[in-house]
């Protein structure tokens, strides 16, 4: 494995990031900030790339299936959380097929830096970006119900994942901004009919003096829909992260009355209509907050909380937040439990009986990397657990109870040592199913002076396709030394976040 020039592998890095985004099933598109390191290895007629990419979350849902550079800048009508990440990627290309880049595996860590960038010393605290987004499922459900009232074709959609929640407080108003994915759950389910996914953004506004949080002053919700039927069949086995693996990605439109406006632009304003919301979270549960006190008067938004979150992830990317389905957690074959290995080698919480803690939420424990400002893990490595998933995308979201019996399995990698996943009382460990290709770990928000911990580099061995010795693994251990001609330059426009990335790697 030899170091290579970061600028020389820019096309591969850009393509690899696109493939990673298309593989992911929840969260927001990663945008490339910088190629932090690059090595390559030539095995016969195949080139193996070992890339380290510095990324930033965009405001476009991965469901949009957009190319990462085609995501427009964020919508300034809504607060935009600043989340950075770093991905270690192994990709291959056949020398004679220049377009045929395949991502073999990837591991990413992400973290919000909004709090670290905020200088709140002399400022009233007015913006909160909540890590525990599940608390706001009730508000998402209510917003979606309101949308359904005016969009008959959304009747069978249900809330899937609560992706982001922000609260803006001050002056005469409070606002809650909730992003969530939805999926179509038709009554008559045809076995080969792929689900239709959507993404909604709801803004809920309240008077500051409003005691009745069931009646927002305004509710604006925009939804867009993505139909996997227009792409490859998600029920089949997707290619090896090569050839864009689309399972959702075009907004539906029609020349007559469009069921959904392009770009999610159908807005709804509902003055003084009843709208249920849970109580606001107690002040000590705020995650990080920032903002100006409202001047002459804008209004407020409202709080959201989640009472009974019956929700299962449908992702296979191990990803940002791992949702928990109280009712069917024992049966859910793809449930991501936070008791799988934490990226920092320990979970900052005690094991809760109902397993509501997630990779994102660390409100009570010490900051898992608070004392490691240079990104070195105290244990010297990041024993991230791989989440179990197959290439066969068996997708149990909010629509169906998952089957008791899991079908076939692919590679059979077990859980990290000592980390059998707990089930319910009196039950043995859940069988660990197929290892997923690629993972994204959401770490707690970074603080000032901290840098993003590096993702793990202990990828499993893999044989290269079309290789003479298919049983012989072809990937080398991920390089730990940094290439001399790296890191590359940050893309313009993101100087503020550069301080949160390590500039060299541990030797």
């Amino acid at each position: 494995v030899s170091p290579t020039d970061c600028s020389a592998v820019e096309p591969e890095a850009e393509k690899a990031l696109d493939l990673i985004n298309k593989r992911r099933r929840d969260g927001y598109l990663f945008q490339l900030l910088r190629i932090a390191d690059a090595h390559l290895d030539r095995v016969e007629n195949t080139t193996v790339y070992y890339l380290v990419l510095d990324v930033q979350e965009s405001d476009c849902s991965v469901l949009s299936r957009k190319y990462w550079n085609d995501c427009e800048p964020p919508d300034s009508r809504r607060p935009s959380e600043i989340v950075i990440g770093q991905c270690k990627v192994i990709a291959t290309r056949h020398s004679h097929e220049s377009q045929d880049l395949r991502v073999i595996d990837f591991n990413c860590t992400t973290s919000s830096v909004s709090s670290a960038l905020a200088n709140t010393k002399d400022s009233p605290v007015l913006i909160d970006f909540f890590e525990d987004t599940e608390r706001y499922r009730k508000q998402a459900n209510k917003a979606l119900e309101k949308y359904k009232e005016e969009n008959d074709d959304f009747a069978s959609f249900r809330v899937d994942r609560i992706e982001r929640v922000a609260r803006v407080r001050g002056g005469e108003g409070t606002g809650y901004f909730v992003d969530f994915s939805v999926r179509n759950c038709p009554r008559h389910h045809f076995p080969r009919h792929p689900n239709v996914f959507g993404f909604c953004r709801a803004d809920l506004f309240y008077d500051v003096e409003a005691l009745d949080l069931e009646s927002p002053k305004n509710l604006v919700i925009n939804c867009e829909v993505f139909d996997p039927q227009e792409h490859e069949n998600i029920n089949g086995v997707p290619p090896h992260l090569g050839h864009p693996f689309h399972w959702g990605g075009h907004e539906r439109s029609s020349t007559t009355k469009p069921p959904f406006k392009p770009h999610g632009s159908r807005d709804h304003h509902h003055p003084h209509k009843p709208h249920e919301h849970g109580p606001p979270p107690p002040p000590d549960e705020r995650d990080h907050s920032h903002g100006p006190p409202l001047p002459q008067g804008p209004p407020p938004l409202l709080p959201m909380s989640c009472s009974s979150c019956q929700h299962a992830t449908f992702g296979t990317n191990g990803a940002q937040r791992h949702s928990h389905n109280n009712n069917s957690s024992d049966l859910h074959p793809h449930k991501h439990h936070s008791h799988e290995q934490h990226p920092h080698g320990h979970h900052p919480h005690a094991h809760h009986p109902h397993e509501h803690d997630t990779h994102r939420q660390h409100p009570h424990g010490h900051h898992p990397h608070g004392h490691h400002p240079h990104g070195h893990h105290p244990h010297g490595h990041h024993p991230h657990g791989h989440h179990p998933h197959c290439h066969d995308f068996q997708d149990y979201g909010p629509c169906d109870p998952p089957p008791h019996n899991q079908g076939h399995c692919c590679h059979g990698h077990g859980p990290p040592p000592g980390h059998l996943r707990r089930r319910g009382p009196g039950k043995g460990p859940r069988p660990f199913h197929c290892r997923q290709i690629g993972s994204v770990y959401r770490l707690p928000p970074l603080r000032k002076g901290e840098v993003l911990p590096l993702p793990e580099a202990n990828f499993p061995s893999f044989p290269l396709p079309h290789h003479k010795h298919p049983l012989k693994p072809d990937n080398q251990p991920f390089p730990q030394s940094v290439s001399e001609s790296c890191p590359g330059k940050f893309k313009s426009g993101f100087p503020q976040v550069s301080m949160f990335f390590t500039h060299t790697f541990p030797k």
Epitope: R77, T120, S123, D203, K217, N218, V220, D267, H290, P495
Partner: antibody
């Protein structure tokens, strides 16, 4: 107390560039969009674009792409707008304003008068 | 771009008179994203009415706002001398954000 303090008036030659500053106090600078608005004498308000200081993300009105460039320094809580290749059409008062989510441009700077004259 | 047309461009009203000015959008605007600003000569604009009908802090209750879709209005129930100013409507429903040309309100 939220305040936006803009730099002083500028008299510029055609073809030159000018950089206007807007120092923010009393709120968390990095998390609110900073808007830039142009007002020519006797004319209405025209949106130039906006920047989110924390990320550096910027949106521009198509009309001002290539004319205006936004930057922000989070260490000094200051936003900047550079105007290039100045002509008499650029003579105007330029305002910075905070976009308060849900409520429009809630706080405004006092304005910076830019005069372009040979 | 969503063009906002304000009418009249200039109007004068006697003290105590009821005043209404309108703002018409070339394409529909969510009422959550329609605001009004007041500007007096030599001063910066001030947020005056937000989300169509909500008065900003310190704005007298004689002001009101209403509308939906492409048609919005600002009304003063009883004109007072301090209300003489230019009023701008503003949408940020779809980028680019746009302002109306303004209605200059003078005292008769």
């Amino acid at each position: 107390q939220v305040q936006l303090q803009q730099s002083g008036a500028e008299l510029m030659k055609p073809g030159a560039s000018v950089k206007i500053s807007c120092k923010a106090t009393g709120y968390t600078f990095s998390t609110f969009w900073m808007e830039w608005v142009k007002q020519r004498p006797g004319h209405g308000l025209e949106w130039i674009g906006e920047i989110l200081p924390g990320s550096g993300n910027a949106n521009y009105n198509e009309k001002f792409k290539g004319k205006a460039t936004f930057t922000a320094d989070t260490s000094s809580n200051t936003a900047y707008m550079q105007l290039s290749s100045l002509t008499s059409e650029d003579s105007a008062v330029y305002y910075c304003a905070i976009h308060y989510y849900g409520y429009g441009f809630a706080y405004w700077g006092q304005g910076t008068l830019v005069t372009v004259s040979a | 771009d969503n063009v906002l047309t304000q009418s009249p461009a200039i109007m004068s009203a006697s003290l105590g008179e009821r005043v209404t000015m309108t703002c018409t959008a070339s394409s529909s605007v969510s009422s959550s994203y329609l605001h009004w600003y007041q500007q007096k000569p030599g001063s910066s604009p001030k947020l005056w009415i937000y989300t169509t009908s909500n008065l900003a802090s310190g704005v007298p209750v004689r002001f009101s706002g209403s509308g939906s879709g492409t048609s919005y209005s600002l009304t003063i129930s009883s004109m007072e001398a301090e209300d003489a100013a230019t009023y701008y409507c503003h949408q940020y429903h779809r980028s680019p954000w746009t302002f109306g040309g303004g209605t200059k309100l003078e005292i008769k």
